[in-house]
Amino acid sequence: APFDDDDKIVGGYNCEENSVPYQVSLNSGYHFCGGSLINEQWVVSAGHCYKSRIQVRLGEHNIEVLEGNEQFINAAKIIRHPQYDRKTLNNDIMLIKLSSRAVINARVSTISLPTAPPATGTKCLISGWGNTASSGADYPDELQCLDAPVLSQAKCEASYPGKITSNMFCVGFLEGGKDSCQGDSGGPVVCNGQLQGVVSWGDGCAQKNKPGVYTKVYNYVKWIKNTIAANS
């Protein structure tokens, strides 16, 4: 594989322990998706990460070892966006209400929703426990991080003709080598301290001219706030 020498996320690095305190792991007997804690009782993830039963794991770094900072809380409500489209992955966003409030501390804390859409060129942090190999399987135990820029909508649409909606944007590198991958879905893209993206899809991982595609959280702030208010 062209980019699998010490690849992390693909091409990232080991996050400093608990340096991404809003990152959660969604577990159904194994880690299947990421998510972001947006308040004490609600998590944002991807619509395609829907399962009828989910355990939300907060304060994780090594997901295979109990390190003492974890909080495991079952999902009480799982609300996929009403216009989620499985075929196109448009509206690929979901809210999870925790069955009890998370305890906020230095290792578990919330991330702010965006106040403006993501600007081209902005450097963002993507994180997750997804596959670190661009071909084959190498799933890490420890949380991986990747710094990557927001790409212009024109470059995004040119990479995926006819597939990019106004609810999606691209982050990454057209030269390949650095990207989110399988297992990172639902996880955060944080730019300037705001949750701008949710890991959604892409053609393969870290392939040339095939950057990662992310749900544009800014378009859903009203839906998120209304849904939380209606289910509190």
């Epitope: 990460c49 009828s52 084959g136 297992g183 890991v199 899809w201």
Partner: antibody, heavy 125, light 107 residues
Framework: QVQLVQSGAEVKKPGASVKVSCKAS????????ISWVRQAPGQGLEWMGW????????NYAQKLQGRVTMTTDTSTSTAYMELRSLRSDDTAVYYC??????????????????WGQGTTVTVSS | DIQMTQSPSSVSASVGDRVTITCRAS??????LAWYQQKPGKAPKLLIY???SLQSGVPSRFSGSGSGTDFTLTISSLQPEDFATYYC?????????FGGGTKVEIK
């Protein structure tokens, strides 16, 4: 409860086709995929292919490409497997099994948690 | 394609014995392995998923371990209803492949 119920046993002549059905109940059909697995008499398990119940995306075993077609009918929560140009070595018990979807950048886990009871297909002249 | 090699192909054991079955993948599959039990004339039944997670309703005497290429299914204390054939399956990528099976027989 979650279950998959398959159609009854079939006896076919070489060169004919067979279509096996698998009716799902107890869960949301379109949230999962269906795999088809067969087992020849006294032999092990052989994966035939996979179909997404929501998008009808398919992935077939290479040795069966061109002879097998998997479909779904979401209105009746039923999956179908058609095998054409039957040969004697297609004699087997055919199983459908529920698996996870492969979508976006979700963890790919292709295990099968619920199985149908099996359909015996005998190919004989 | 990823080849799955199971060993032994058969094992004779007595009630109460500890039985270990191994499965080796021809390339790394991380934790994406499942174990099934099959009794004559019946459909396979999922025992273990994601290498070590016990399927709901399966007795705790069954356990799984391993990651990468080498995996193990252990029955800590064999019971009469455990005499069956056991299969591993790589769940990492298409085409899905199974091991050849291990038949656990009464000694």
């Amino acid at each position: 409860q979650v279950q998959l119920v398959q159609s009854g046993a079939e006896v076919k002549k070489p060169g004919a086709s067979v279509k096996v059905s698998c009716k799902a109940s107890g869960y949301t059909f379109t949230d999962y995929a269906i795999s088809w697995v067969r087992q020849a008499p006294g032999q092990g398990l052989e994966w035939m292919g996979w179909i997404s119940a929501s998008t009808a995306d398919t992935n077939y075993a290479q040795k069966l490409q061109g002879r097998v077609t998997m479909t779904t009918d979401t209105s009746t929560s039923t999956a179908y497997m058609e095998l054409r140009s039957l040969r004697s070595d297609d004699t087997a018990v055919y199983y459908c099994a529920r698996g996870t979807e492969v979508v976006g950048k979700m963890t790919v886990y292709l295990g099968m948690d619920v199985w149908g009871q099996g359909t015996t297909v005998t190919v004989s002249s | 394609d990823i080849q799955m090699t199971q060993s032994p192909s058969s094992v004779s054991a007595s009630v109460g014995d500890r039985v270990t079955i191994t499965c080796r993948a021809s390339q790394g599959i991380s934790r994406w392995l499942a174990w099934y039990q099959q009794k004559p004339g019946k459909a396979p039944k999922l025992l273990i998923y994601a290498a070590s997670s016990l399927q709901s309703g399966v007795p705790s005497r069954f356990s799984g371990s391993g990651s990468g290429t080498d995996f193990t299914l252990t029955i800590s204390s064999l019971q009469p209803e455990d005499f069956a054939t056991y299969y591993c399956q790589q769940a990492n990528s298409f085409p899905i492949t199974f091991g050849g099976g291990t038949k656990v027989e009464i000694k």
